[in-house]
Amino acid sequence: LQDLCSNCPAGTFCDNNRSQICSPCPPNSFSSAGGQRTCDICRQCKGVFKTRKECSSTSNAECDCISGYHCLGAECSMCEQDCKQGQELTKKGCKDCCFGTFNDQKRGICRPWTNCSLDGKSVLVNGTKERDVVCGPSPADLSPGASSATPPAPAREPGHSPQ
């Protein structure tokens, strides 16, 4: 009997109710390999998901995220809300980066500005919520009489990051 089932190709299942006959997978289901005793359930791309690839009798559907959201994971198992640059997503929605932190993308968390002084350098361009500071030459490298750039503010902990 097992041999009969192994003959069932992808897109079918081995139907025990019908004497091991290979039956096509019902609507909204699929089997990606031969010899299956049950068909898998097709994924539905609804809500914040949109269909990238329709389900077939031999392969599952693939989803993308609708505008304003981005995929998490290579298989787009979840959609996460986009935020603006200078923000991060928290449990309560998009929040501006705390002073001393920045985010130059629509996703991810706010990260502390670079501490130029750790590399013995000075701040050439101040940081913003959207951009990191730009470090310049060390104060010692500046010619006498040259004005020193404003030192960086102490970095604070970034806001709560989504799980």
Epitope: T38, I41, Q44, G73, A74, E75, S77, M78
Partner: antibody, heavy 119, light 112 residues
């Protein structure tokens, strides 16, 4: 394709236990939600946790299970459920189940493994 | 948390008759509902998915309907082999901190 649970045992209250679910005839290279469901003797089904076997590895827990139960993918064919601080209320048959839909619909189940918590 | 309320708790039917089981979700779950059959000493078996789609190998006398918060499983032309406990299950994956998934309490079907 089949699932087999192992690790069920008679343990004392307060003990910890790890259950294993082993997949045969398929692997997690195809992305699934692998889940644990339990059933106390003579009672109904109770969902515990799921893990997405794809790259994100996302985990999902029933509110009551958070903190005491931990689901993990330990290989391309095994998923575990770690349980701590067990009480008599955790006495149940624990089933492993597979979902390809993303919506808590399990088309493949193991036979279950019995966990008994008693002093 | 999502709560699934299933009625009745028990129902009796004659062979050839019809059984209707209801399931109510505490919030809108679209069509993300499954029905299972479980016999003593066995794991549950998927019957219906997405509220109305028949799972592979399930006889056509089983049918499901509904959307949102109200769902129904119907067994038409009940057979002796249909004596079992039936469960509805609803839910969907949102995020790790807000997950919704639950089973109904079950309905025992007795065939006379």
């Amino acid at each position: 394709q089949s699932l087999e649970e192992a690790g069920g045992d008679l343990v004392k209250p307060g003990a910890s236990l790890t259950l294993t679910c082993t997949a045969s005839g398929f692997s997690f290279t195809s992305s699934y939600y692998m889940c644990w469901v339990r059933q106390a003797p003579g009672k109904g089904l109770e969902w515990i946790a799921c893990i997405y076997t794809g790259s994100s590895g996302s985990t999902y827990y029933a509110n009551w299970a958070k903190g005491r139960f931990t689901i993990s993918k330990t290989s391309s064919t095994t998923v575990t459920l770690q349980m701590t601080s067990l009480t008599a209320a955790d006495t149940a048959t624990y089933f492993c189940a597979r979902d390809s839909s993303s919506y808590y619909m399990f088309n493949l189940w193991g036979q279950g493994t019995l966990v008994t918590v008693s002093s | 948390a999502l709560v699934m309320t299933q009625t009745p708790a028990s129902v009796s039917a004659a062979v050839g008759g019809t059984v209707t089981i209801n399931c109510q979700a505490s919030e809108d779950i679209d069509n993300y509902l499954a029905w299972y059959q479980q016999k003593p000493g066995q794991p549950p078996k998927l019957l219906i998915f997405y509220a109305s789609d028949l799972a592979s190998g399930v006889p056509s006398r089983f049918s499901g309907s509904g959307s949102g918060t109200q769902f129904t499983l119907t067994i038409s032309g009940v057979q002796c082999d249909d004596a079992a406990t039936y469960y509805c299950q609803g839910g969907y994956y949102t995020s790790s901190t807000d997950t919704r998934g639950a089973f109904g309490g079950g309905t025992e079907v007795v065939v006379k």
